[in-house]
């Protein structure tokens, strides 16, 4: 079975939301829904694994109720008709409250692991390769939804590639209903390694700076800083790092480092006070020559929420802020899977980091 | 390296209070969820309480349920068991325990990583 | 709740014996399934999970299977440092989402 690398995520769509799974649903497939249950308005919410965006063929409909005690139903639609239900009679999400929703996608069936404990399984009632797009409906606000493919080394790219001049990554922040598939940068022949999602939230209506209801705020802090983690099997082609967070209102800057041992081989350094996105590398405490062009104006804003993707290829990074290119950095220190260490520090908060 | 530690056991009386600490080392606690699980006199495991730190989520035993109250900061990457109106049967050895759900493109439906244990005892 | 009734609740068995400790879950759990060594004094360790995966840097001499509802933890030659108390462990969201068997005590014959 041929697999790319992972599609990008879906960040802060809004709801009802429809979305393109690239490939469709694949054997080994991690599917990530994270958001925050509304409190104010509506008994239900959905997720549902369909064929198109009509809604007739629906091949896994997870709908939570909050109704006689709660509960969650699963089913099936079948050209505009639902077969029997199956019911969970223990509602693992609360109203008002941020929820982690994975789906994995195996051959038999899917598995649904709901804030880090497994839910329900669903065995398939049609073949699960027909799917082909992901839909989200019902009082639920929406944080990201996110792919990650299995570790398999790919025969051929699954989806067809988009030149890297035309916007990239992740899609705009969704006005409409339906979502297109995203630009997204040339899949990689690679293998796709682990992918380890670190995600607190102190506050997730703020996680974009155009929230659906008012920010909420929760008993547990944002991530500690300076953060600092572990990037598992280091760089390599293809390999994604994804932040997200906000900009402190009186922020002077802030820096994303990428290192290898003692070295930085990578420093993003946005500097609100020279207006600039400063990139640069330090080998044995010796900095090399700044790169700051950029094309277009300075995309972090103070007090604004903003998500960077960070992608490995063979010859450079390629980054990208709240879904648009931004710039290349060709690498300076090239032993790839030496560079396994993310430090982020300076004037921001934190709200989601996927190594 | 991933490591677990407990604190904050000791005697009480019935009745009484005691905050456990589970401090992590080694992984972020808002990347997995933690447990407490207690562990009687001669007696086997008893599964008390988990927290899923990034939603806040929270879950407990029957047995504990209105009593006991588990949180995290994750800022002090430190897991917490706030024990009220304490029993005589909540005597037990406390381990908090790490729930990895993905490693290494696998799950993992375990506990993988467990503290040393803090003992409370209640009796008067 | 999901009960997890693991059975022997104890038995004796010599070094190099093959020994099969079965749980058996109330209800389906998937394969939200782990088993754990403990030996007095000590927290319990990782042996199985899901089901069926060997935990890194546990002996292969350790496994475990799955039929429907039943799990069994197999030892296919007891080791000296075997000898302790395994515990079964399911983790389907429940009422309870974590439910431990009540343990077996393997003894030295």
């Known amino acids: 079975m041929a697999f790319s690398g992972s599609q990008a995520p879906y960040l802060s769509p809004a709801v009802p939301f429809s979305g393109t799974i690239q490939g469709g649903l694949q054997d080994g497939l991690q599917i990530t829904v994270n958001g925050t249950v509304l409190s104010s308005s509506g008994t239900r919410f959905a997720v549902n694994f369909q064929t198109g965006f009509s809604g007739n063929d629906i091949a896994f409909h997870f709908n939570p109720r909050f109704e006689d005690g709660g509960y969650v139903v699963c089913n099936t639609r079948q050209n505009g008709s639902w077969g029997p239900e199956e019911r969970k009679t223990h509602m693992p999400f609360q109203k008002g409250m941020p929820f982690d929703l994975c789906f994995l996608v195996q051959s038999s069936d899917f598995k649904v692991m709901v804030n880090g404990i497994l839910f329900v399984q669903y065995f398939h009632r049609v073949p699960f390769h027909r799917v082909d797009t992901i839909s989200v409906n019902g009082s639920v606000q929406l944080s990201y939804i996110s792919f990650q493919n299995p570790r398999t080394v790919p025969v051929q790219p699954a989806f067809s590639t988009v030149p890297f001049s035309q916007p990239v990554c992740f899609p705009p922040r969704p006005r409409g209903r339906r979502q297109k598939p995203p630009g997204v940068w040339p899949a990689n022949p690679a293998p796709i390694t682990q992918t380890v999602i670190h995600t607190v939230q102190s506050a997730p209506g703020q996680m974009f700076s155009t929230p659906a209801i008012p920010p909420m705020m929760y008993p547990h802090p944002a991530y500690p800083m300076p953060f600092i983690t572990t990037i598992l099997g280091g760089l390599y082609p293809s390999k994604s790092i994804l932040l997200s967070g906000t900009v402190l209102p009186s922020a002077q800057r802030f820096h994303i480092n990428l290192c290898s041992g003692n070295h930085i081989a990578f420093h993003l350094n946005p500097r609100f006070d020279e207006n600039a996105v400063v990139r640069n590398t330090q080998i044995d405490n010796s900095w090399g020559s700044e790169e700051r062009s950029l094309p277009r104006k300075m995309p972090f804003v103070r007090g604004q929420s903003f998500s960077v993707w960070i992608l490995c290829e063979a010859h450079c990074l390629k980054v990208a802020v709240d879904g648009q290119h931004l710039f290349e950095y060709y690498h300076r220190l090239r032993n790839l899977p030496t560079i396994n260490r993310l430090e982020v520090g300076g004037d921001i908060q934190l709200t989601h980091v996927q190594t | 390296e991933v490591q677990l530690v407990e604190s904050g056991g000791g005697l009480v009386q019935p009745g009484g209070s005691l905050r456990l600490s589970c401090a992590a080392s080694g992984f972020t606690v808002s990347s997995s969820s933690i447990h407490w699980v207690r562990q009687a006199p001669g007696k086997g495991l008893e599964w008390v309480a988990y927290i899923y730190p990034y939603s806040g989520y929270t879950s407990y035993a029957d047995s504990v349920k209105g009593r006991f109250t588990i949180s995290a900061d994750t800022s002090k990457n430190t897991a917490y068991l706030q024990m009220n109106s304490l029993r005589a049967e909540d005597t037990a050895v406390y381990y908090c325990?790490?729930?990895?759900?993905?490693?290494?493109?696998?799950?993992?439906?375990?506990?993988?990583?467990w503290g040393q244990g803090t003992l409370v005892t209640v009796s008067s | 709740d999901i009960q997890m009734t693991q059975s022997p609740s104890s038995l004796s068995a010599s070094v190099g014996d093959r020994v099969t400790i079965t749980c058996r879950a109330s209800?389906?759990?998937?394969?939200?399934v782990a088993w754990y060594q403990q030996k007095p004094g000590k927290a319990p360790k990782l042996l199985i999970y899901?089901?069926?995966s060997l935990y890194s840097g546990v002996p292969s001499r350790f496994s475990g299977s799955r039929s429907g509802t039943d799990f069994t933890l197999t030892i296919s030659s007891l080791q000296p440092e075997d000898f302790a108390t395994y515990y079964c462990q399911q983790s389907y969201y429940d009422s309870n989402p974590i439910t431990f068997g009540q343990g077996t005590k393997v003894e030295i014959k």
């Open positions: 899901s089901a069926s």
């Open positions: 209800q389906s759990v998937s394969s939200a």
């Open positions: 325990a790490r729930y990895s759900t993905y490693s290494s493109s696998k799950w993992v439906w375990g506990m993988d990583y």
